[in-house]
């Protein structure tokens, strides 16, 4: 673990409330093949131990949808990913918008600092798959 | 090599006959900028040699695709990635459909263990792109 | 330095005239959370300075763009990843369109060398958002 | 707090139509979906069809060709018309307000229900 | 369509006991993570009301007493201890595909 090979591959447990964007991550061996090795989770979001850059990536599909699906509902889904704490770091990393697809992924690399807590926020009206298959949220410490 | 730095980085080779959903693979450098280093194929599978967590991606593109081609055909067309064996280990690793779009990408972090075989199923009456900067699919070890 | 973890994120900084179907890139700590450590930009083209297989990845989203955005436009709106000199060893590396969606991201791993200069090229009518969370595009030395 | 008021009316006569108004409060036409669902003795409860926030309706394959769903928004008013009715249609007709999540497909608020008697 | 079939038709529970409904669907009704299965309670001239949604998810100001379990075809609504107020015919719903189905119902009644 010295390396600082800090690493972390989640499932989705559920959403939040409804004022509450946040998605809600899980993690371990137990839940199927999530982990975390080195960061940590509090509350459900994930929060970085180790300073460096990160590849962050993400994929979240949209619960029994259908291309049709995304168009009926008038708020457009939209997934961001980013630091939400501490306050001063936080910041916008990574943001995607469903449009008429059911599934958004991508991947980014990017600086983070020990104790930056990442928050995967989705706005809309759509509850997401908790298929592990589907809906999955990692990052991978790369350099210092 | 002793590293565990194995990856690979493949190409379309072909699709299977009408009831094998598999897409087969080929890599190398007399075929463009595809490789194998550690990890090898097995008729066209891409077969793991060392135990560890992978970054696993990939990119299909349907060919001579318009927004309107993937709307006309009746069962979606879906992109699974998977461990197809040793059957004790079988599981969908990543899944996607293309609803309205004509490509799929994505990427995850997964544990591998020496002698799983990843299967790349394409679903649907769609052929895919074998356009190699199209459609492609790796695996890169990043730890242990 | 000397491990070789060449590593790059970049920023849109802007588009190129109009037969110039370039995007060029920015990136430093002090325009955000862009960086470049170890390859170069050129004139807003990203310049590699070590060989090895490098990680490349790219999320492009379009300025002010809904899902009917795209299908207004009569010619397709493609994302292409190549290097673009030395000349002989021009060649697309990643290709995407947006179709009826307004972002595109992918990823893959490719072999670079010493002085591959990386073009993104980005075709059609529509112009890129410039947002660092929407559009971005980075490359990672992974191996030798 | 939501509320969904039905008015329309109680007798319609065979092969006419039925047109009932659903007005809303508590909550936005804009952000959340409206379904309609009726309740006879001999058929129990059916989803006759929905309108989403955007406007877009899907309605049950049964009833497709003579249901209509519409809406005004600033008025936080939902339209029903079905058409040409038969005594099989007599039933009490509810509105109800799907939950937050879009594509949950339930019903957390009804209206108190119009009784409609399709008789000459 | 999803055919939902309730059972029983009727119950007569005594007070503080157990009351099981059962509800079983022609197809799986669980997708993407999630059982697609809700649960209303109607009495004599209301509207239904929920009372679960996703199979198990109590709704907002229902009484913990109202527990839903199940995935795939075959699910349970159980209440207890049962209360005088609880008299009431109960319906699944489930919302997997369109279109939404109801059971055909299954009256309560408080001995």
């Known amino acids: 673990e010295s390396l600082g090979w800090d690493i972390a591959e989640l499932q989705l447990n559920h959403t939040g409330p409804q004022q509450d964007p946040r998605l809600y991550w899980q993690g371990g061996p137990a839940l199927g093949r999530s982990f975390l090795r080195g960061p940590e989770l509090d509350k459900g979001q994930l929060r970085i131990r180790r300073d460096g850059i990160y590849m962050v990536h993400i994929q979240v599909t949209l619960a029994i949808c259908s291309s049709t699906s995304t168009s009926r509902h008038h708020h457009p889904t939209t997934l961001a990913v980013g630091i939400c704490s501490p306050a001063s770091r936080s910041i916008s990393l990574l943001r995607l918008s469903f449009h008429q697809g059911c599934t958004i992924a991508s991947q980014r690399l990017t600086p983070l600092a020990r104790g930056d807590t990442l928050c995967t926020n989705l706005t809309g009206t759509l509850l997401p798959s908790r298929n592990t298959d589907e809906t999955f949220f990692g990052v991978q410490w790369v350099r210092p | 090599e002793s590293l565990g730095w194995d990856i690979a980085e493949l190409q379309l080779n072909h699709t299977g006959p009408q009831q094998d959903p598999r897409l087969y693979w080929q890599g190398g450098p007399a075929l463009g900028r595809s490789f194998l280093r550690g990890p090898e194929l097995d008729k066209g599978q891409l077969r793991i040699r060392r135990d560890g967590i992978y970054m696993v991606h990939i990119q299909v593109t349907l060919a001579i695709c318009s927004s309107t081609s993937t709307s006309r055909h009746h069962h979606p067309t879906t992109l699974a990635v998977g461990i197809c064996s040793p059957a004790s280990r079988s599981i969908s690793l990543l899944r996607l459909s293309f609803h309205q779009g004509c490509t799929i990408a994505s990427q995850r972090l997964t544990p591998l263990a020496r002698g799983d075989t990843l299967c790349t199923n394409l679903t649907g009456t769609l052929l895919p792109s074998r356009n190699t900067d199209e459609t492609f699919f790796g695996v890169q070890w990043v730890r242990p | 330095e000397s491990l070789g973890w060449d590593i790059a994120e970049l920023q849109l900084n802007h588009t190129g005239p109009q037969q110039d179907p370039r995007l060029y890139w920015q990136g430093g700590p002090a325009l955000g959370r862009s960086f470049l450590r170890g390859p170069e930009l050129d004139k807003g083209q990203l310049r590699i300075r070590r060989d090895g297989i490098y990680m490349v990845h790219i999320q492009v989203t379009l300025a002010i763009c809904s899902s009917t955005s795209t299908s207004r436009h009569h010619h397709p709106t493609t994302l292409a990843v190549g290097i673009c000199s030395p000349a002989s060893r021009s060649i697309s590396l990643l290709r995407l369109s947006f179709h009826q969606g307004c972002t595109i991201a992918s990823q893959r791993l490719t072999p670079l060398a010493r002085g591959d200069t990386l073009c993104t090229n980005l075709t059609g009518t529509l112009l890129p958002s410039r947002n660092t969370d929407e559009t971005f595009f980075g490359v990672q030395w992974v191996r030798p | 707090q939501v509320q969904l008021q039905q008015s329309g009316p109680g007798l319609v006569q065979p092969s006419q139509s039925l047109s009932i108004t659903c007005t809303v409060s508590?909550?936005?036409?804009?952000?959340?979906?409206v379904h309609w669902v009726r309740q006879s003795p001999g058929k129990g409860l059916e989803w006759l069809g929905v309108i989403w926030s955007t406007g877009i309706t899907d309605y049950n394959a049964a009833f497709i060709s003579r249901l209509s769903i519409s809406k005004d928004n600033s008025k936080s008013q939902v339209f029903f018309k079905m058409d040409s009715l038969q005594s099989d249609d007599t039933a009490i007709y509810f509105c109800?307000?799907?939950?937050?999540?879009?594509?949950?497909?339930?019903?957390?608020?009804w209206g108190q229900g119009t009784s409609v008697t399709v008789s000459s | 369509d999803i055919v939902l079939t309730q059972s029983p038709a009727s119950l007569a529970v005594s007070l503080g006991q157990r009351a099981t409904i059962s509800c079983r669907a022609s197809?799986?009704?669980?997708?993407?993570?999630?059982?697609?299965m809700h649960w209303y309670q109607q009495k004599p001239g209301q509207a239904p009301k929920l009372l679960i949604y996703l199979a198990s998810n109590l709704e907002s100001g229902v009484p913990a007493r109202f527990s839903g379990s199940g995935s795939g075809t075959d699910f349970t609504l159980n209440i207890h201890p049962v209360e005088e107020e609880d008299a009431a015919t109960y319906y699944c719903?489930?919302?997997?595909?369109?279109?939404?189905?109801f059971g055909g119902g299954t009256k309560l009644e408080i001995k």
């Open positions: 109800a307000r799907n939950p937050h999540y879009g594509n949950l497909n339930a019903m957390d608020y």
């Open positions: 197809k799986s009704v669980s997708a993407s993570g999630y059982t697609w």
């Open positions: 719903q489930h919302s997997r595909e369109l279109p939404p189905t």
């Open positions: 508590g909550f936005s036409l804009t952000t959340y979906a």
